[in-house]
Amino acid sequence: CKAMHVAQPAVVLASSRGIASFVCEYASPGKATEVRVTVLRQADSQVTEVCAATYMMGNELTFLDDSICTGTSSGNQVNLTIQGLRAMDTGLYICKVELMYPPPYYLGIGNGTQIYVIDPEPCPDSDF
């Protein structure tokens, strides 16, 4: 297993609709054809997997149908979008990239993006 540098923004504020997008960029040492991207969430020392996708270079990322993540790839960049976020989902989202094929296997883990999520203010009751 060889190490690889992964860069991602330090802080992102999700939209009022609970959507956060960020770019995860990796310094590919070779010509990988198969890449796996995993998003991990770290909150209060607990690390959980949010979503993962394996893709062939030049093709779209395919997450599971029920995944809260979508993404696109361009060269050594992956543009990740996480949807359906609420204030309780605020935390550090870490991008993990694995170059699966061809060998050698490379692994890179970013420093994480702190995603802040603000629940929208409830609408005041109206007399209609």
Partner: antibody
């Protein structure tokens, strides 16, 4: 080195608006957020809100909602805070600070004194 | 909104003494997202501690932070003349990012 440099002191009349700038250097501006904090004379720190320089999304303190607007110009790595309908109790030193996620507000500007007086 | 309470309001000590400052949160949020700042007259605040216990770059090891949940402490092991200032705690785990009212450490 990493720093935030703010615009100079302002004197405004009640009802007017003020726009304070905060120029960042020494780091990738869009990777972080910028928060604004004010301090009235002899008082503590009051958080006003922040903007994610990555996507321009904003979050304001409830008491200032509707009066404050925070923006960024990524081409010049500058953040702006505009406060409208100024009142005498808006007289304060206004600080910008870098929002660094887990690393808190790690870099602060030198402060901008805004005086509201008729 | 998480409300932070700091105690005491003022702490009068002599150089060389140990200072213990307390910060209590009204509710337990992301407990590790607590910071301490130092502010001297006419200056901007300076980050001392983030993540409840991690020292910021360039901060001397006489400053230490501890605590979790709703109770946090900033300890200055041996006060130096330059440590006499106002200290603020802040929670930044959820919006709004509230500050405590501050503790003034002055010379006895």
């Amino acid at each position: 080195q990493v720093q935030l440099v703010q615009s100079g002191a302002e004197v405004k009349k009640p009802g007017a608006s003020v726009k304070v700038s905060c120029k960042a250097s020494g780091y990738t501006f869009t990777n972080y957020g910028i928060s604004w904090v004010r301090q009235a004379p002899g008082q503590g720190l009051e958080w006003m809100g922040w903007i994610s320089a990555y996507n321009g999304n904003t979050n304001y303190a409830q008491k200032l909602q509707g009066r404050v607007t925070m923006t960024t110009d990524t081409s010049t790595s500058t953040a702006y805070m505009e406060l409208r309908s100024l009142r005498s109790d808006d007289t304060a030193v206004y600080y910008c600070a870098r929002v660094a996620g887990y690393d808190a507000f790690d870099i602060w500007g030198q402060g901008t004194m805004v005086t509201v007086s008729s | 909104e998480i409300v932070l309470t700091q105690s005491p309001g003022t702490l009068s000590l002599s150089p060389g003494e140990r200072a213990t400052l307390s910060c209590r949160a009204s509710q337990s949020g992301s407990s590790s997202y607590l910071a301490w700042y130092q502010q001297k007259p006419g200056q901007a605040p300076r980050l001392l501690i983030y993540g409840a216990s991690s020292r910021a770059t360039g901060i001397p090891d006489r400053f230490s932070g501890s605590g979790s949940g709703t109770d946090f402490t900033l300890t200055i092991s041996r006060l130096e003349p330059e440590d006499f200032a106002v200290y603020y705690c802040q929670q930044y785990g959820s919006s709004p990012f509230t500050f405590g009212p501050g503790t003034k450490v002055d010379i006895k």
